[in-house]
């Protein structure tokens, strides 16, 4: 399977959802749950999904997980997975989503979704 490279519309939708979550955060997101941080590179949407899937009973990120599943419906094969699957540090979900938003905006600005 190739590394998922999203179209502009699907990436824009994810960005809007991440903005909505991170800007409207009133209390610790998902009760302050921790997830594995990532080197958000080539398979970042798959890697992000793999990290967030461990968080259950947190309806706020349910839509984000579904969007990531839509962007990465098939698991990348081992040959396409590199450093983004190194798991050595855990961070709060809120920070994770901010990092994902920042990287997604960079991809969108660079137009590398085509």
């Amino acid at each position: 399977s190739p590394n998922p490279v999203p179209s502009s519309s699907s990436l824009k939708e994810l960005i809007e959802e991440l903005v909505n979550i991170t800007q409207n955060q009133k209390v610790p997101l998902c009760n302050g749950s921790m997830v594995w941080s990532l080197n958000l590179t080539s398979s970042m949407y798959c890697a992000a999904l793999d990290s967030l899937i461990s968080i259950s009973n947190c309806s706020v990120i349910h839509r984000t997980k579904r969007m990531l599943s839509a962007l990465c419906p098939h698991k990348p094969s081992a040959k396409h997975v590199s450093s983004e699957y190194v798991r050595d540090t855990k961070i709060e979900v809120a920070q994770f989503l901010k990092d994902l938003l920042r990287h997604s905006r960079i991809i969108f600005r660079n137009g590398s979704y085509n």
Partner: antibody, heavy 118, light 111 residues
Framework: EVQLVESGGGLVQPGGSLRLSCAAS????????MSWVRQAPGKGLEWVAS???????YYPDSVKGRFTISRDNAKNSLYLQMNSLRAEDTAVYYC????????????WGQGTLVTVSS | DIQMTQSPSSLSASVGDRVTITCKAS??????????VHWYQQKPGKAPKLLIY???NLESGVPSRFSGSGSGTDFTLTISSLQPEDFATYYC?????????FGGGTKVEIK
């Protein structure tokens, strides 16, 4: 009503081409990955193709280079262009909503029959 | 490719019976602790329907008499008390590796 409706099946000669369509309704089509799965008469299920919401495509080796999956979000439609058809491609072709490797194929159409025969 | 082997290929049972179907993968289908196996029900002339995702999670709207278990290479679908509408063919499917593959199916018939 949330549903998928396939069309375009029929009888085609070996080496011929056919284009299947799948009309989605009742959900935000553009927000989901989609797949085609086939079932030969009296046999089991076989995954044929998938397309992400971002238009990344995936195929098994059995159809790679012959089949092309595509989507038109404006028309809420999924397509499967099938070229160089073989007798072993004879099957009912199902369109399915693909919610990813963690969630499976959550919604299926009723299927359309493709018969490859001379 | 990962082969998914279901057993039995068919079985006869009565309404109220407890039915167990097994699915064995040719290699582990676990990914970061999650088992990427799903179960579907198909009635004659109809499309498949998702019952269980990720080995043990009940899909929304599916009766609680259906349950799934297992990890690694061995998985089980259980129907705790068979109902008339449960007579159908059941398929397991793995999504841990492309190509996604299905088991050969288990046909549950009326005894």
């Amino acid at each position: 009503e949330v549903q998928l409706v396939e069309s375009g099946g029929g009888l085609v000669q070996p080496g011929g081409s056919l284009r299947l369509s799948c009309a989605a309704s009742g959900f935000t089509f553009s927000s989901y990955a989609m797949s085609w799965v086939r079932q030969a008469p009296g046999k089991g299920l076989e995954w044929v193709a998938s397309i992400s919401s971002g238009d990344t495509t995936y195929y098994p080796d059995s159809v790679k280079g012959r089949f092309t999956i595509s989507r038109d979000n404006a028309k809420n439609s999924l397509y499967l262009q099938m070229n160089s058809l073989r007798a072993e491609d004879t099957a009912v072709y199902y369109c399915a909503r693909n919610e990813g490797y963690y969630f499976g194929l959550t919604l299926w159409g009723q299927g359309t029959l493709v018969t490859v025969s001379s | 490719d990962i082969q998914m082997t279901q057993s039995p290929s068919s079985l006869s049972a009565s309404v109220g019976d407890r039915v167990t179907i097994t699915c064995k993968a040719s290699e582990s289908v676990d990914h970061f602790g999650w088992s990427l196996v799903h179960w579907y029900q198909q009635k004659p002339g109809k499309a498949p329907k998702l019952l269980i995702y990720r080995a043990s999670n009940l899909e929304s709207g599916v009766p609680s008499r259906f349950s799934g278990s297992g990890s690694g290479t061995d998985f089980t679908l259980t129907i705790s008390s068979l109902q008339p509408e449960d007579f159908a063919t059941y398929y397991c499917q793995q999504s841990n590796e492309d190509p996604w593959t299905f088991g050969g199916g288990t046909k549950v018939e009326i005894k």
